[in-house]
């Protein structure tokens, strides 16, 4: 325990000390004081120093004294013989005899005090940065103004830290720049940018000045950046020894300033602003970038548009162009977004044609539609190549997106017809030669297949039966022929609005306009036994002359028969409409002059008895194109006649091609009714 | 067919984290982005950030960086939104989405409850 | 950031009516806008995506127009299931920040 004052006496003392004795005394006064030690009396066998008896004074590791012999005080108000001042609050005193003493010595008696020391003033080492003060039993440190004490309560320095800098740009210098920076200080300074931002540093070497380093190169005062793992400097001497500009890489810059207790100078300056963080330029394949610039940075965005053909595609729906932004880490958003050729997905079929599998779907391939030759043919031109556009279409260069068309090739038989063997008025025919030849059952006539869904026959012919069963495709009309050729089923019978409806058909005398047209419900497939006949063309080519030949067909009344079960043909030549006036009717069912010619008909036969007859109605004049000699025509149908194997009269077709058309045309769509 | 399912509801304390996770089928997490976003209730959806699982990228709104950080294990086709010094205003639903082009896909969301 | 503000924040409807909805953006955003429907307890879904394309399976009664900032959403006829809360979001630039709302209920 500390005390502030005590005696010491030398064993025995005042009687003569014992030989081969080692004492020690541990003298401890309270913290901030020292200790003055004064003897009173000495008495101790006196030797060379002091080496046989001795009192040693000791503070810490060093020997204030070493006392032997006799002593007496030279101030006669004084009983002081010897005195030791330390400024430490610890003292030793160890005493020694040897074995053998020649006189009676007495020994010491010391006694110690506790005294203020004045700690700014005794001790080389001066306890405070600045300003000491003393005071009994301890001293206190201060500082001058705008400097603050540390936490050791003895250095002083200046607050300089804490201060954050978050705008784009700015200037930061050392305390009171230019003036000396303050010693002993430790100044951090902190610039923190938005994210995407890195931070630029800039210094001219001239606002550069801070202690120079030691001889062993180590800065005595220093300036360091320090930006997440990387560090700049440290840095000191006169004139900056780093980059002018230090490109940080980071949004975070730590400043940390050190400085030690000597040599002060200016200090130093610096600017810094925040550099947007750059993104590279990529090379997106079949893209354009926009706006193209040689440098991109943080905010900057990008249109990126694929080029004609290509598309960003997510799942099942795609894109032509996307936004790209330069994000605050240095890389584009979106970049997973990439052009990839537009897929124009597998071909639609088309009816009545085929297109080949093709080896690609994407954009530029190619592919073609053919129709099933020779029943078809595409009617909408454009060769039926198409390839994969950059709109995601197959595009043909005529058609565009539309597709092609294969629509029935008219007019031309598998088999020509030829007048082999000689029946009377006629020969038997083959369905090849007549592919267009419709049947109907009830009444027994006949009829035109003009395309998929429509035949043409006489208007007389459905008048009563406006839900005619019909045949395709048999040379046979017999029952079982029938059951395995093509049975058509109408959906709408139109009469041309000219025939006039007779409550008795039966008495009829005018056949004026003696044509129908009849939509089928389901479209007829073509082919060798199945195609159209071709419509007259309106030009003059079209018009008949006398003479003109054209081939009938059907299985009606012969010479023989009122009724033939295979298909009859016969080539008559057209002749001029008083040769039938001329012949008279065979069984008249009214006046001769009550029957009615017209334009709209024409008169053909006449020769070698060949014409055509009861159930042959509705059946085709089939006459050679004059533009295409390898199609036919219907010129007409067969309507009427005067007598059979003399001349018949025929439906000019050719007159009512308007008429067939727009009523095609206004019904070309399944009727819902 | 392509899924995003969340982990259930949570409840928790104001200052602690929470992490929830979605889980991806019917595509690989590395061909998109996976996005998080949150709705508090009755309230509107805010975006908080995505990332980018092919390489770990990820972008953060303003508003929660710092306090959210979006990971992806792209071994479990999963990714993971962890929210950290909750507070009573982050009670909401937290829903994931993928995009490339736009959010085509979304979790089922995942309510966390932050209350003391 | 950019903001994204819709009007009305919410709408009475009839079954039938024709409604638009309108959403317009602090900054031009292009065409880089989406929009999404969601029902109670429910997760959002697209409907329009890049302003004015329709997303796979969405009705031909939605479609969106607009560029730069200001950008509509048409229902055409509405039905019973279109009854629902609607949100445009801006896919321009990070962060993608979504309009506030607007609710669409029954007359």
């Known amino acids: 325990e500390p005390t502030m004052y005590g005696e010491i006496l030398s064993p025995n003392y005042p009687q003569a000390y014992p030989s081969e004795v080692e004492k020690s005394w541990d003298i401890e006064v309270p913290e901030g004081y020292g200790i003055h030690l004064y003897f009173t009396h000495l008495d101790i066998e006196l030797s060379e120093n002091c080496a046989y008896d001795s009192v040693q004074i000791i503070s810490g590791d060093t020997e204030e004294g070493r006392l032997c012999g006799q002593r007496s005080s030279n101030n006669p108000h004084s009983p002081i013989v010897e005195e030791f001042q330390v400024p430490y609050n610890k003292l030793q005193v160890i005493f020694k005899s040897d074995f053998s003493n020649e006189e009676r010595f007495t020994g010491f008696a010391a006694y110690y005090v506790a005294t203020d020391i004045n700690e700014c003033t005794d001790f080389v080492d001066v306890p405070c940065s600045h300003f000491c003060n003393n005071f009994i039993g301890g001293y206190f440190c201060s500082c001058p103004p705008e400097y603050f004490l540390h936490d050791d309560m003895k250095n002083c320095g200046v607050n300089c830290s804490g201060d954050v800098f978050t705008a784009l740009i700015g200037e930061i210098a050392s305390p009171n720049y230019p003036k000396p920076y303050p010693e002993n200080s430790r100044c951090e300074y902190q610039i923190r940018l938005e994210k995407g931002f890195q931070v630029v540093v800039t210094l001219r070497r001239e606002d550069f000045d801070v202690e120079a380093a030691d001889s062993a190169g180590n800065c005595l005062d220093s300036l360091v950046f320090v930006a997440g793992d990387r560090q700049f400097g440290p840095y000191c001497g006169h004139g900056f020894p780093g980059p002018l500009n230090i490109e940080t890489k980071s949004n975070a810059l730590d400043i940390i300033f050190q400085t030690d207790l000597t040599g002060q100078k200016k200090g130093w300056k610096l600017r810094y602003h925040g550099d947007p963080m750059p993104c590279p330029k990529e090379d997106t394949p079949n893209s354009v970038w926009e706006p193209a610039k040689a440098k991109y940075v943080f905010r900057d965005v990008v249109q990126i548009t694929c080029l004609d053909g290509f598309e960003v595609v997510e799942g099942r729906v795609g894109a032509t162009s996307f936004y790209s932004t330069c994000q605050s880490n240095g890389k584009w958003s979106n970049s997973k977004l990439k052009c990839q050729p537009v897929d124009c997905g597998i071909p639609e079929p088309i009816e009545n044609g085929k297109v080949e599998d093709p080896e690609s779907t994407l954009f530029g391939s190619v592919i073609r539609y053919t129709c099933e030759e020779p029943y078809y043919y595409m009617e909408n031109g454009g060769g039926g190549e198409y390839h994969c556009a950059g709109n995601g279409s197959w595009v043909n260069e005529v058609l565009g997106p539309e597709l092609p068309k294969c629509v029935p090739v008219c007019g031309v038989p598998r088999e020509p017809f030829e007048e082999k063997q000689r029946i009377i008025g006629g020969s038997d025919a083959d369905i090849k030669n007549f592919p267009w030849q419709v049947f109907f059952d009830n009444p027994w006539a006949g009829g035109a297949l003009i395309n998929e869904y429509w035949v043409l026959t006489a208007a007389h012919v459905v008048e009563g039966n406006r839900e005619p069963t019909m045949y395709v495709g048999s040379t046979s009309v017999q029952t079982s022929r029938l059951a395995k050729s093509k049975m058509l089923t109408p959906e709408h019978v139109f009469i041309h609005p000219g025939w006039k409806l007779l409550e008795v058909p039966e008495g009829r005398t005018n056949f004026d306009n003696d044509i129908a047209l009849v939509r089928l419900k389901d479209p007829v497939k073509m082919g060798p036994t199945v195609s159209p006949i071709c419509l007259p063309g309106t030009s003059s080519d079209y018009n008949l002359m006398d003479g003109d030949l054209g081939l009938i067909s059907g299985w009606g009344r012969t010479e023989k028969r009122d009724r033939a079960v295979r298909l009859k043909a016969a080539r008559l030549p057209v002749a001029p409409l008083r040769k039938c006036k001329e012949v008279k009717v065979e069984k008249p069912t009214a006046d001769a002059e009550a029957y009615v010619f017209t334009p709209n008909m024409i008169c053909a036969g006449g020769e070698k008895g060949m014409d055509s007859c009861k159930g042959d109605s509705g059946g085709a004049f089939a006459v050679q194109d004059p533009n295409d000699k390898t199609k036919f025509y219907a010129a007409g149908l067969v309507s009427w006649g005067p007598q059979c194997g003399t001349y018949g009269l025929y439906t000019r077709v050719k007159n009512y091609v308007d008429w067939i058309m727009k009523t095609m045309q206004e019904n070309s769509t399944p009727r819902e009714d | 067919q392509v899924q995003l399912v969340q982990s259930g509801a949570e409840v928790k304390k104001p200052g602690a984290s929470v992490k929830v996770s979605c889980k991806a089928s019917g595509f690989n997490i590395k061909e998109y982005y996976m996005h998080w976003v949150r709705q508090a209730p009755e309230q509107g959806l805010e975006w908080m950030g995505w990332?980018?699982?092919?390489?770990?990228?990820?972008i953060y709104a303003q508003k929660f960086q710092g306090r959210v950080t979006i990971t992806a294990d792209t071994s479990t086709n999963t990714a993971y939104m962890e929210l950290s010094s909750l507070r009573s205003e982050d009670t909401a639903v937290y829903y994931c989405?993928?995009?490339?082009?736009?959010?085509?896909?979304w979790g089922q969301g995942t309510l966390v409850t932050v209350s003391s | 950031d950019i903001q994204m503000t819709q009007s009305p924040k919410s709408l009475s409807a009839s079954v039938g009516d024709r409604v638009t909805i309108t959403c317009r953006a602090s900054?031009?955003?292009?065409?880089?806008l989406d929009w999404y429907q969601q029902k109670p307890g429910q997760s959002p879904k697209l409907l329009i995506y890049s302003a004015s394309y329709r997303y796979s399976g969405v009705p031909s009664r939605f479609s969106g127009s607009g560029s730069g900032t200001d950008f509509t959403l048409t229902i055409s006829s509405l039905q019973p299931e279109d009854f629902a809360t609607y949100y445009c979001q801006q896919q321009y630039t990070t962060p993608y920040t979504f309009g506030q709302g607007t609710k669409l209920e029954i007359k």
């Open positions: 900054q031009d955003v292009r065409t880089a």
């Open positions: 989405a993928r995009s490339r082009l736009f959010f085509a896909y």
């Open positions: 990332i980018d699982p092919e390489n770990a990228d990820t």
